[in-house]
Interface confidence: medium
């Protein structure tokens, strides 16, 4: 396959509600009509797939119903949002982009976005 450059932010801090958003941008060498975006999580040298979506250019990304990811696309940028994150989910989240159609097939893998998740402090007990 052919290589393609993918850029993503180095660090993102999740919100107190466990939501993290980042942009994944790819340098498309041609006029792709079908693109697949996959988010991978690397932690302790293990890589697992978090979510994936295939979309037609100009259309919305469609993740599976039970996915923790949502996203929108604009040109060669994909805005990804990961929800339901907890402190244990802190790790390097890698954006992988594949230009599926038309040929040739291009593959690009970003350097990863370190997402930090801090669990909110529980509210102190109150007698009131």
């Amino acid at each position: 396959c052919k290589a393609m450059h993918v850029a993503q932010p180095a660090v993102v801090l999740a919100s107190s509600r466990g939501i993290a958003s980042f942009v994944c941008e790819y340098a498309s060498p041609g006029k792709a009509t079908e693109v697949r975006v996959t988010v991978l999580r690397q932690a302790d040298s293990q890589v697992t797939e978090v979510c994936a979506a295939t979309y037609m250019m100009g259309n919305e990304l469609t993740f599976l119903d039970d996915s923790i990811c949502t996203g929108t696309s604009s040109g060669n940028q994909v805005n990804l949002t990961i929800q339901g994150l907890r402190a244990m989910d802190t790790g390097l989240y890698i954006c992988k982009v594949e230009l599926m159609y038309p040929p040739p097939y291009y593959l690009g893998i970003g350097n990863g976005t370190q997402i930090y998740v801090i669990d909110p402090e529980p509210c102190p007990d109150s007698d009131f």
Epitope: C1, G30, T33, E34, M56, E98, M100, Y101, P102, P103, P104, Y105
Partner: antibody, heavy 121, light 107 residues
């Protein structure tokens, strides 16, 4: 046995329409991209159009863009080519061909299985 | 679009001869090239894919080589059934494009 059988060819006046069909058998049809390739009398091979495994993406040669439409019905193991606004230069033998692609649509190795063709005049 | 220039357009050879056909791409296509044989009234048959990989069932006298823009099909010892027209096809980028063809005739 892996087989592709084309039909639907015939004689048509300039400006007319025709719909070609290709029936596939002997392989899992929706694992493969498909193409139409034509050959004018006494001439070489010309790729006309291609479609990916699920019909979601298509491609066309400049010579037919806007006039021809490729489609497929995976439930019927069939490929189609709707040809509108036909011209004299579209006269050819039209072959249906299977794309030798890895993992449905990641990488293409050209066409490995061909039908005998149907004639459009 | 990628243009494929095939040469020669025709050649005469005898049984047992070594035959070489070349194909030149207008831009680099890595090894994304196939070779096809076509006999009159028949569908094309793939001989070589990915520039040098032999299609299953094809005799080993057929071989392919090259990468980038220059490619070669070689028939090491021409047999009577090899008299046909040969085409190269780039399968790197849409639209797929074929060479003009090389007709191999009996001398």
């Amino acid at each position: 046995e892996v087989q592709l059988v084309e039909s639907g060819g015939g004689v048509v006046r300039p400006g007319g329409s025709l719909r070609l069909s290709c029936a596939a058998s002997g392989f899992t049809f929706d694992d493969y991209g498909m193409s139409w390739v034509r050959q004018a009398p006494g001439k070489g091979l010309e790729w006309v159009s291609g479609i990916n495994w699920n019909g979601g993406s298509t491609g066309y040669a400049d010579s037919v863009k806007g006039r021809f439409t490729i489609s497929r019905d995976n439930a019927k193991n069939s490929l189609y080519l709707q040809m509108n606004s036909l011209r004299a230069e579209d006269t050819a033998l039209y072959h249906c061909a299977r794309e030798d692609n890895w993992r449905k649509y990641y990488y293409y190795y050209g066409m490995d299985v061909w039908g005998q063709g149907t004639t459009v005049t | 679009d990628i243009q494929m220039t095939q040469s020669p357009s025709s050649l005469s050879a005898s049984v047992g001869d070594r035959v070489t056909i070349t194909c030149r791409a207008s831009q680099g296509i890595r090894n994304d090239l196939g070779w096809y044989q076509q006999k009159p009234g028949k569908a094309p048959k793939r001989l070589i894919y990915a520039a040098s990989s032999l299609q299953s069932g094809v005799p080993s006298r057929f071989s392919g080589s090259g990468s980038g823009t220059e490619f070669t099909l070689t028939i090491s010892s021409l047999q009577p059934e090899d008299f046909a027209t040969y085409y190269c096809l780039q399968h790197n980028s849409y639209p797929w494009t074929f060479g003009q063809g090389t007709k191999v005739e009996i001398k």
